[in-house]
Amino acid sequence: QLPPGKPEIFKCRSPNKETFTCWWRPGTDGGLPTNYSLTYHREGETLMHECPDYITGGPNSCHFGKQYTSMWRTYIMMVNATNQMGSSFSDELYVDVTYIVQPDPPLELAVEVKQPEDRKPYLWIKWSPPTLIDLKTGWFTLLYEIRLKPEKAAEWEIHFAGQQTEFKILSLHPGQKYLVQVRCKPDHGYWSAWSPATFIQIPSDFTMND
């Protein structure tokens, strides 16, 4: 029977800069029941606070609701593991909410085959940013990535769309049914999950662009 091993806070994520959650990995438990507590203070403060919510994020997590989340202050936090034989602390972790944003997937993905008379046909893809993200303030720059493939293909074709919310693809296999998805990330955050797939049938007379 031993004191617990050193825990590690390994992940913090925010869907929108208004709330965030951090997760830790326990160290070895020393063969005894072990209690974990996360304490934190914000830059410029000395007063330590305990995690406000150990439930919402699941096991080994701390969730900071709206009233506990500030974009203006860096959070300094650590996890304490305690059993009957003693305690151990994680390294201190510094968190700036701006840099942990992982948005929800983009919305309203629409895909259409366009066949203008005077130009090559193309696949037109359009989407909207996730609802929770406020792009008007300028705090966020969202970048987008599209992936598509014929229904039975193994490999995805990936296109980086930058900040635009629509995209044209010229080179497609006629007569094939394609799956299309889009995801987004802030310039200094994490990729969202892929949006639900949208299916599109490419007409047999679609002329491939070389």
């Epitope: 590690e8 390994f10 992940k11 913090c12 800069k17 990995r25 830059e43 410029g44 974009m71 203006w72 860096t74 390294d91 972790l93 510094y94 968190v95 700036d96 701006t98 840099y99 942990i100 303030t137 300028g138 705090w139 990330k185 200094h188 994490y190 990729w191």
Partner: antibody, heavy 118, light 112 residues
Framework: EVQLVQSGAEVKKPGSSVKVSCKAS????????IHWVRQAPGQGLEWIGE????????NYNQKFKGRATLTVDRSSSTAYMELSSLRSEDTAVYYC???????????WGQGTLVTVSS | DVVMTQTPLSLSVTPGQPASISCRSS???????????LHWYLQKPGQSPQLLIY???NRFSGVPDRFSGSGSGTDFTLKISRVEAEDVGVYFC?????????FGGGTKVEIK
Amino acid sequence: EVQLVQSGAEVKKPGSSVKVSCKASGYTFTSYWIHWVRQAPGQGLEWIGEIDPSDSYTNYNQKFKGRATLTVDRSSSTAYMELSSLRSEDTAVYYCGRSFFTNWFAYWGQGTLVTVSS
Amino acid sequence: DVVMTQTPLSLSVTPGQPASISCRSSQSLVHSNGNTYLHWYLQKPGQSPQLLIYKVSNRFSGVPDRFSGSGSGTDFTLKISRVEAEDVGVYFCSQSTHVPFTFGGGTKVEIK
């Protein structure tokens, strides 16, 4: 204990390439961005770029775009910085650095001296 | 790119005396999120840089309280209230508000 251990000194010919490694230990490698900074002899510090080891997403200083390539090998918790078309002005100590969930770096490697000379 | 200008270039200080280093940026370092990402690093002789101050005025873990940072917008200052022998080295200011991140040219602090 968090450690960033870099590869040894290199001497290269002008026009060639160099690949510097930075092996991370003491933390979950995919959690934090790795930055690369260089320091020419007797000079200040110059930021080359950064990479997110979780998905290999990169941001480069435009000055180095096309000549510097940042990569990671997640299986060995190692980050790499490759610089091509070397010239004498690239002679410098190259550092890797690690951020927290922030955009400043708290941990630095010991540095790798790259000398470019004919 | 944001140009960071440090003054003075070098500083010779008697132990126990204060020291002050100035850093000026060519444009405001206030991020669109309201934070100011101006940091100070110390590079001791033969070593890698180490973080002293982050976001203008916050001491990093383990940094003695004789180090303090202040400023806003484009003008920033690092102060050492009482210089000790272990404080010798080159001090760099750095901004990470704008990409590319940039550094000042450095201020060499030595002991008289």
